[in-house]
């Protein structure tokens, strides 16, 4: 009786289990009674990432400078070419088939996680006690200065756009 | 048993953008080549893109590179295709399809499709 | 890229008739050759992989045969339910390409 499914690295065609190629391998021609799977490695060029039965390699991944990519990791005949961004850009996606400018947090939010090629930048609010003043894709939020060391008092309160304005005490006579 | 279930289709303006999505059920997703075929109205069947299990490696056919982008999120079993500067030609029924053991075509198991309208 | 060229574009036949379908490559595509069936408002369905393999749940009655450059998909006595439209689609080269399909209607 024919099999109706394959151990695993294997697979049915014409009634019978074959052999998957190996990784870095594409299939040039199925098994039989007689002869066992035909595969034949990749070229120079190319890839295979798993246990298969492609009848072609996958070229590797060309990253486009004019995209703002560069290789991070070379491709081998099991893997694919992985592109990154070039420095202030991130990718746009988990394949990284391009890159954008990372995004600068605004005044009243600090940055929480600074930007990789792979990542955005990550921005939160300013709490409390805590501002800032310029568009930044590097600044945190700065905690308002503290009137009281200096032996100042606060004449103006801050907000998570601006600092404390701090000012001499008032002299009682 | 396998499912795969699409969301996302509508009528878009030429150079809007929209994204499908395929939720996949019944078979290890990330072992999987999963793709993207569309059908104009009327019309046969055409090859859009195609992702690796990994999620690393990407193809597109050349109407639409630079401009479509297929992903996947293995731990949610979801495939996406994020589509941007969209044209009338891209108006299709558009179909994700998981290759069979081993292989990125044919394909096994198709979802139910969703429809694209581009037109102003 | 492979170009598949179907005929004839629409087969008009009866139930319980022989319908033949044939797939012309522009070149070699080996053995890796696909059958799907489709029907108005449907999904594609597998029927054949590699020239002559039936998917899982297809009945006997279709069949593949060819290599190369001239495949044919053969069913062998025409259902009601098989009226539909046929699509053949290579995958010995890249990007995998689908025929124009034929259409097989009732007469």
């Known amino acids: 009786e024919p099999p109706t499914a394959c151990r695993e690295k294997q697979y049915l065609i014409n009634s019978q289990c074959c052999s998957l190629c190996q990784p870095g391998q594409k299939l040039v021609s199925d098994c039989t009674e007689f002869t066992e799977t035909e595969c034949l490695p990749c070229s120079e060029s190319e890839f295979l990432d798993t246990w298969n039965r492609e009848t072609r390699c996958h070229q590797h991944k060309y990253c486009d400078p004019n995209l703002g990519l560069q290789v991070q990791q070379k491709g081998t005949s099991e893997t694919d070419t992985i592109c990154t961004c070039e420095e202030g850009l991130h990718c746009t996606s988990e394949s990284c088939e391009s890159c954008v400018p990372h995004r600068s947090c605004l005044p009243g939010f600090g940055v929480k996680q600074i930007a990789t090629g792979v990542s955005d930048t990550i921005c939160e609010p300013c709490p409390v006690g805590f501002f800032s003043n310029v568009s930044s894709a590097f600044e945190k939020c700065r905690p308002w200065t503290s009137c009281e060391t200096k032996d100042l008092v606060v004449q103006q309160a801050g907000t998570n756009k601006t600092d404390v304005v701090c000012g001499p005490q008032d002299r009682q006579r | 048993q396998v499912q795969l279930v699409q969301s996302g289709g509508g009528l878009v303006q030429p150079g809007g953008s929209l994204r499908l999505s395929c939720a996949a059920s019944?078979?290890?997703?990330?072992?999987?080549?999963m793709s993207w075929v569309r059908q104009a109205p009327g019309k046969g069947l055409e090859w859009v893109s195609t992702i690796r299990g990994s999620g690393i490696s990407t193809y597109y056919t050349d109407s639409v590179k630079g401009r479509f982008t297929t992903s996947r999120d293995n731990p949610k079993n979801t495939l996406f295709l994020q589509m941007s500067s969209l044209r009338a030609e891209d108006t299709a029924v558009y179909y994700c399809?998981?290759?069979?053991?081993?292989?990125?075509?044919?394909?096994?198991?198709w979802g139910q499709g969703t429809l694209v309208t581009v037109s102003s | 890229e492979i170009v598949l060229t179907q005929s004839p574009a629409t087969l008009s036949l009866s139930p319980g008739e022989r319908a033949t379908l044939s797939c012309r490559a522009s070149q070699s595509v080996r053995s890796f050759l696909a059958w799907y069936q489709q029907k108005p408002g449907q999904a594609p369905r597998l029927l054949i992989y590699?020239?002559?393999n039936r998917a899982t749940g297809i009945p006997a009655r279709f069949s593949g045969s060819g290599s190369g450059t001239d495949f044919t998909l053969t069913i062998s006595s025409l259902e009601p339910e098989d009226f539909a439209v046929y699509y053949c689609q290579q995958r010995s080269d890249w990007p995998p390409t689908f025929g124009q399909g034929t259409k097989v209607e009732i007469k």
């Open positions: 590699e020239t002559s």
């Open positions: 399809a998981k290759g069979i053991v081993g292989a990125t075509t044919p394909f096994d198991y």
């Open positions: 019944g078979f290890t997703f990330s072992n999987y080549v």
